[in-house]
Interface confidence: low
């Protein structure tokens, strides 16, 4: 009956971690004697090719300085300890500890048997490194030029992580890759870039990092922070301001980052009705008169700049009962 070597075509191990390279001689054959088990790296320089050996009487040996005896062990193989115990070499699984990038490559497990001769199997060891991911917003001020508003960094991955962004904004990503501090690893940085405006402030975008060491992609939310001048609108005008009306108010509605530092009410005509009193973001009208036939301007400032809005007021002689309640902007 023929015997064969059962190995995995590919094994993945974490950089710095421990990996097992399975190797079994199958099936169990009565009378088959295993005289030696060896692990070799056929692609390595000559003095590094013989990685490990297990002799039925002498036990394990690790002739190559790389990986070396301090990082190698046989998981299950047992040597004969006397006349009463047989060596157990059918399972030649090899463990590598403290994986390095240099450990990546082909490994050949070979059984020297009597009377069947030598049989072997080959495994490709891939060394991967699980990256550390982080994402953060960059505090930016509005401008007309595309600016990096968020960074997503996948640090020291092997192979390099794939970074993408999930967002409804109009954006583009700029990616750079540099060698990690751990040999053989790559740090990937993706810059989420857009023309920063108030529309982007406070919006949460998501950095998606994919890597074969993850069961699922890592999703990292980032809340954008864009400093922008006030975006102003005026509310409160209902197209039904009439002479003598006393309950009228205009409100200056603002979106800004940072918060407004000042509000200023004025008119385009330069004349400001005495019965209109500015109270911060509100303009309270005690009594509407003909001077209110004008355009009111609210100017708002913050640390970035200023914004303004205008509201044209039409003063009626008498209340408009038909269209009352319609709002104007």
């Amino acid at each position: 009956q023929d015997v064969r070597v059962q190995v995995l075509p590919e094994v993945r191990g974490q950089l710095g971690g421990t990996v097992e390279l399975p190797c079994h001689l199958l099936p169990p054959v009565p009378g088959l004697y295993i005289s030696l088990v060896t692990w070799q790296r056929p692609d390595a320089p000559a003095n590094h090719q013989n990685v490990a050996a297990f002799h039925p009487k002498m036990g394990p040996s690790f002739p190559s300085p790389k990986p070396g005896s301090e990082r190698l062990s046989f998981v299950s193989a047992k040597q004969s300890t006397g006349q009463d115990t047989e060596a157990e070499l059918q399972d030649a699984t090899l463990a590598l500890h403290g994986l390095t990038v240099e450990d990546e490559g082909n490994y050949t497990c070979e059984f020297a048997t009597f009377p069947k001769g030598s049989v072997r199997g080959m495994t490709w060891l891939r060394v991967i490194a699980k990256p550390k991911n982080q994402a953060e917003a960059q505090k930016v001020t509005f401008s007309q030029d595309p600016t990096t508003v968020a960074l997503c960094i996948s640090k020291e991955g092997r192979p390099p992580a794939r970074i993408s962004w999930l967002s409804s904004l109009d954006w583009e990503a700029k990616e750079t890759q540099v060698s990690g501090t751990l040999a053989g690893t790559v740090t990937v940085t993706s810059r989420f870039t857009l023309v920063p405006s108030g529309r982007a402030d406070g919006v949460t975008v998501t950095c998606k990092v994919e890597h074969e060491s993850f069961e699922e992609p890592a999703l990292i939310p980032v809340t954008l922070s864009v400093r922008y001048p006030p975006e102003v609108s005026i509310s409160g005008y209902d197209d039904n301001w009439y002479l003598g009306r006393t309950d009228a108010t205009l409100s200056c509605d603002v979106r800004s980052n940072p918060e407004p530092t000042g509000y200023d009410w004025s008119t385009t005509s330069g004349t400001f009705p005495t019965s209109a009193v500015a109270q911060g973001s509100q303009l309270v009208i005690h009594a509407v008169d003909s001077l209110f036939n004008t355009t009111f301007v609210c100017t708002v400032t913050n640390a970035v700049g200023m914004g303004r809005a205008e509201q044209v007021i039409f003063v009626r002689e008498t209340p408009n009962t038909a269209g009352a309640g319609a709002t104007g902007g």
Epitope: Q14, G16, G17, A129, K130, P131, K132, N133, Q134, A135, E136, T204, T206, S213, F214, E215, E216, A218, L219, I220, P221, T223
Partner: antibody, heavy 116, light 111 residues
């Protein structure tokens, strides 16, 4: 100054649901990942769970089913679904500054005593 | 979920250097953090991302990692450093997320 404060800790009987609330001042709570951590008298710190700024919630394996974390725009809540005497501890809420950095701001803690 | 092991207590003479260790049972590819907690107070973040110090933390506190061990070093211990110290790390593998604290080390400053 930025600060966190927990509230809702009190003496409860076993099995009585209890909700703890974490309130922030000086920063926008909704922009941060927030964690709950507890410490039994004379014992070490024990992580309960975290809620991300996007609303994703993760629990310690031992805490699943025993606690529920939720948030509004201004608070983060920890509901103890059916407390036992082993849940007697000081409960802290903590701000998780950014992904994989650490908890850079902690509340003073609120004491929950579960006793019959 | 991995386990972080810290010595239960460590003593140091005033002004001397002391190192507190934190060993993971499996090699962590995540960052270590260190927290200081004084009696009756909330913990305070001392070290993040293995080696970084938040503003306000004295530079006598430093962090390092080697293999699966994180170390907090206090270069010249002061009486005010007497406290419990906790290491912590996170595991973001797959769909789960866990944050793990070590059991804590009680530091006593003598002299």
């Amino acid at each position: 100054a930025q600060s966190l404060e927990e509230s809702g800790g009190r003496l409860v009987t076993p099995g009585t649901p209890l909700t703890l609330t974490c309130t922030a001042s000086g920063f926008t709570l909704s922009s941060y990942h927030m964690s709950w951590v507890r410490q039994a008298p004379g014992k070490g710190l024990e992580w309960i769970g975290i809620i991300s700024s996007g609303g994703s919630i993760y629990y310690a394996s031992w805490a699943k089913g025993r606690f529920t974390i939720s948030r509004t725009s201004t608070t983060v809540d920890l509901k103890m679904t059916s407390p036992t005497t082993e849940d007697t501890a000081t409960y802290f809420c903590a701000r998780y500054a950014a992904y994989s950095i650490g908890m850079d701001l902690w509340g003073p803690g609120t004491l929950v005593t579960v006793s019959s | 979920q991995f386990v972080l092991t810290q010595p239960a207590s460590v003593q140091v003479n005033l002004g001397q250097m002391v190192s507190l260790t934190c060993t993971a049972d499996t090699l962590s590819r995540s960052y270590a953090s260190w927290y200081q907690q004084k009696p009756g107070q909330a913990p305070v973040l001392l070290i993040y991302r293995d080696t970084s110090r938040p503003s306000g933390v004295p530079d006598r506190f430093s962090g390092s990692t080697s293999g699966n061990t994180a170390t907090l070093t206090i270069s010249g211990a002061q009486a005010g450093d007497e406290a419990d110290y906790y290491c912590a790390t996170d595991d973001n593998s797959g769909s789960s997320y866990q944050y793990v604290f070590g059991g804590g080390t009680q530091l006593t400053v003598t002299g």
